[in-house]
């Protein structure tokens, strides 16, 4: 096929997709024109396996990313529950576009949240301490609407201060009880998540959370006799 | 360099109600969670409740609907309110807070007891 003479603008550079939790964000690089007063504006479009293109905007996915001036489109913005479902292939593709001209389509691989996601840490972890115990709640990294289709296991690494590390897990709880510790000791411990994809075998390891340090009660017969 | 400063105990008959509160002060950078615990003569302690700054509670099976549990965060103060209280509820009450004094490397959060609040129910 003969060029397209419309096509004359460079196209945008680095196009990157940040699938973290549930973030989907598409960035790249601003195209740069040193001879136009009036700002380049990108346009994404999305397509599911078998699907036409579509153009990114209120309609379709529930932000605009059509006409824009920024140089990146989150298709989470609107809530943590939007953007494009986790279990479907969804390919990328954006141009520039100037006035009547516009660049060629850069294709981004296709994507699967699940496949792809990078899993952050347990949040909002809180812990209990008990004789020779530590209860251990926290949430999930991110909510998932079908826990059938996916869900969270976790694990608990943990060690006596000055100690070596243990693992226990996986657990399915947002509740882990650290049993059988020794009394009036300070245990660290770090939480992570996994992501189980049930579709596809597929799993995504999360990162730890920060270390934190607990101390176990002392034994409840002596600790409080005054 | 914690202290806790409980008051509200006392002498109370069956089926009243008392209000136990808990101060703590000095080196806190962050105190989670908060309660009170129990400890009747010879017998060994129990948690009464407990709250966390997510505001999970934790009762007793004993004290369930008897007693709320609350804590305003600001004042780093924990309040116990009891009501309904039964002669097997007599027991020396302490206040439990788990505190990251901010002096370690990591968070770290360690225990610490108020002196303990006689409560007596009786007629």
């Known amino acids: 096929a003969p060029p397209d003479p419309l096509s004359q603008l460079p196209a945008p550079q680095h196009p990157k997709i940040r699938l973290y939790n549930a973030e989907q964000v598409l960035s790249w690089e601003p195209v740069a024109l040193s001879n136009s007063t009036r700002p380049v504006v990108y346009q994404v479009q999305f397509k599911y396996t078998d699907s036409k293109w579509f153009t990114a905007d209120i309609m379709s996915i529930g932000v605009n990313c059509t006409q824009i001036t920024a140089t990146e489109c989150d298709f989470t913005a609107a809530s943590p529950s939007a953007g494009f479902p986790m279990d479907f292939n969804v390919t990328l593709r954006l141009r520039a576009e100037l006035g009547a001209l516009h660049s060629a389509w850069v294709t981004m691989p296709w994507f699967q949240h699940y496949r792809n996601v990078t899993v952050g840490p347990p949040e909002n972890i809180e812990v209990t301490p008990g004789e020779g115990s530590l209860i251990i709640r926290f949430s999930s990294p991110f909510d998932i609407a079908d826990t059938s289709t996916a869900f969270f296991c976790y694990y608990v690494h943990y060690w006596e201060k000055g100690g070596i590390q243990q693992v226990k897990g996986p657990f399915r709880s947002n509740s882990i009880s650290l049993d059988n510790l020794k009394p009036s000791r300070v245990y660290c411990l770090q939480v992570q998540a996994q992501l189980l994809w049930n579709k596809s075998n597929i799993f995504r390891v999360g990162h730890l959370s920060n270390i934190s340090c607990y101390e176990t009660m002392a034994d409840a017969s002596t600790e409080l006799q005054q | 360099q914690v202290q806790l400063q409980e008051s509200g105990g006392g002498l109370v008959q069956p089926g009243g109600s008392l209000t136990l509160s808990c101060a703590a002060s000095?080196?806190?950078?962050?105190?989670?969670?908060m309660g009170w615990y129990r400890q009747a003569p010879g017998k060994r302690r129990e948690l009464v409740a407990s709250?966390?700054?997510?505001?999970?509670?934790t009762y007793a099976d004993s004290v369930k609907g008897r007693f709320t549990i609350s804590r305003d965060n600001a004042k780093n103060t924990v309040y116990l309110q009891m009501n309904t209280l039964k002669p097997e509820d007599t027991a020396v009450y302490y206040c439990?807070?788990?505190?990251?004094?901010?002096?370690?490397?990591?968070?770290?959060?360690?225990?610490?007891w108020g002196q303990g609040t006689l409560v007596t129910v009786s007629s």
């Open positions: 439990h807070a788990y505190v990251d004094t901010g002096n370690y490397e990591y968070p770290q959060y360690e225990n610490y």
């Open positions: 000095g080196s806190i950078v962050s105190i989670n969670p």
């Open positions: 709250l966390t700054n997510r505001g999970i509670t």
